[in-house]
């Protein structure tokens, strides 16, 4: 068997809402993956499990099942959404994300994703980790690759 390549492309969009009373931030983060099947037979993308970390704390998890079948020598782009919650001991972030004097409220998140593929009863897992920045102050749509973590205004990690 040849390789199945998984490439994490980046954040596609981040939609934010707040619970004012609870000082809680809700971020729905949609990510994009490219999965390439280098084999001469079809493979099934059985599931994608993802989690998002902020400051070493897991703030969101998602799992997608029975996603798609990728034909021989084909590639598919898959979007998946992880709902995240920043609250409790991180409620200071509420003040950062709602501070009106800041233009772009970028926070650095670690995106972790594991793709499970199957072919002829054989299962294979491929994992990726990537730091991305996301604006927690407004709804944002990103050009693919635009959210790559470089050097952004952010609270202490």
């Amino acid at each position: 068997p040849r390789s199945i390549d998984v490439k994490y492309i980046g954040v596609k969009s981040a939609y934010v809402s707040y619970d004012v009373q609870k000082r809680t931030i809700y971020l729905n983060i949609t990510n994009t993956l490219n999965i390439t099947n280098n084999n001469y037979y079809s493979v099934e993308v059985e599931n994608i499990t993802a989690q998002v970390q902020f400051s070493k704390t897991v703030i969101g998890k998602a799992r997608l099942n029975n996603i798609t079948i990728i034909g021989p020598l084909d590639m598919k782009q898959i979007d998946y959404t992880v709902p995240t919650v920043i609250a409790e001991e991180m409620s200071y972030m509420y003040d950062f994300c709602t501070l009106i004097s800041i233009k772009v409220h970028n926070i650095v998140l670690m995106m972790q994703v594991t793709v499970t593929t199957t072919y002829f009863g054989h299962s294979e897992q491929i994992s990726q980790e990537r730091y991305q920045y996301v604006d927690c102050g407004r709804n944002t749509t990103y050009q693919l690759g635009q959210s790559e973590y470089l050097n952004v205004l952010q609270p202490q990690q």
Partner: antibody, heavy 120, light 112 residues
Framework: EVQLQQSGAELVRPGASVRLSCIAS????????MYWVKQRPEQGLEWIGR????????EYVPKFQGKATMTADTSSNTAYLQLSSLTSEDIGVYYC?????????????WGQGTSVTVSS | DVLMTQTPLSLPVSLGDQASISCRSS???????????LEWYLQKPGQSPKLLID???NRFSGVPDRFSGSGSGTDFTLKISRVEAEDLGIYYC?????????FGSGTKLEIK
């Protein structure tokens, strides 16, 4: 330490213009909006407007449109307020202000104020 | 523009008393993100204003807990539970929800 250092007091002739400066230290002004506030003698605070120093985009209170011009120079980390066609109505103290973020909390920053006197 | 109306203009108090200042906005000042950017400042003579409360009731760092803010929509209140000498000065409410931002006219807290 985050600081806003404003230029010294100005005594100007009626009809003249003056440019006030506000030098920021401890943070990069291009990451924040900068605001200007006016206070006439023995009067309250009046919000003049705000500037996005990165692209120069400005918002003014209508009564200050044409009277005040906000600019910024990101290379020197300085915000400016120009006042034109000065009259006795423009006498007062002018403050620059912004709110920055420091690790886990916000910091409210005000300059010490620049006093403008208009007299012939 | 949003007009901020403060009452009273002057508030004579005895040290140790409770003081209450009211601020009313001419329109709802809930920001599009759901937050209400209603703030309270204290200005002492010859000094720059100092932020006490932001987002209606959030006491700013270093502000004593005798200061509290409340309200919603268009009606807001600042309470000082036990007035101390260092609390004397002029209090301003401020709205930062809708551009152009606006201050109230101020309330002078003074000794009776």
């Amino acid at each position: 330490e985050v600081q806003l250092q404003q230029s010294g007091a100005e005594l100007v002739r009626p009809g003249a213009s003056v440019r006030l400066s506000c030098i920021a230290s401890g943070f990069n002004i291009k990451d924040y909006y900068m605001y200007w506030v006016k206070q006439r003698p023995e009067q309250g605070l009046e919000w003049i407007g705000r500037i996005d120093p990165e692209d120069g985009d400005t918002e003014y209170v209508p009564k200050f449109q044409g009277k005040a011009t906000m600019t910024a120079d990101t290379s020197s980390n300085t915000a400016y307020l120009q006042l034109s066609s000065l009259t006795s109505e423009d006498i007062g103290v002018y403050y620059c202000t912004t709110r920055t973020w420091d690790l886990y909390y916000a910091v409210d920053n005000w300059g010490q104020g620049t006093s403008v006197t208009v007299s012939s | 523009d949003v007009l901020m109306t403060q009452t009273p203009l002057s508030l004579p108090v005895s040290l140790g008393d409770q003081a209450s200042i009211s601020c009313r906005s001419s329109q709802n000042i809930v920001h599009s993100n759901g937050n209400t950017y209603l703030e309270w400042y204290l200005q002492k003579p010859g000094q720059s204003p100092k932020l006490l409360i932001d987002k209606v009731s959030n006491r700013f760092s270093g502000v004593p807990d005798r200061f509290s803010g409340s309200g919603s929509g268009t009606d807001f209140t600042l309470k000082i539970s036990r007035v101390e000498a260092e609390d004397l000065g002029i209090y301003y409410c401020f709205q930062g929800s809708h551009v152009p931002f606006t201050f109230g006219s101020g309330t002078k807290l003074e000794i009776k």
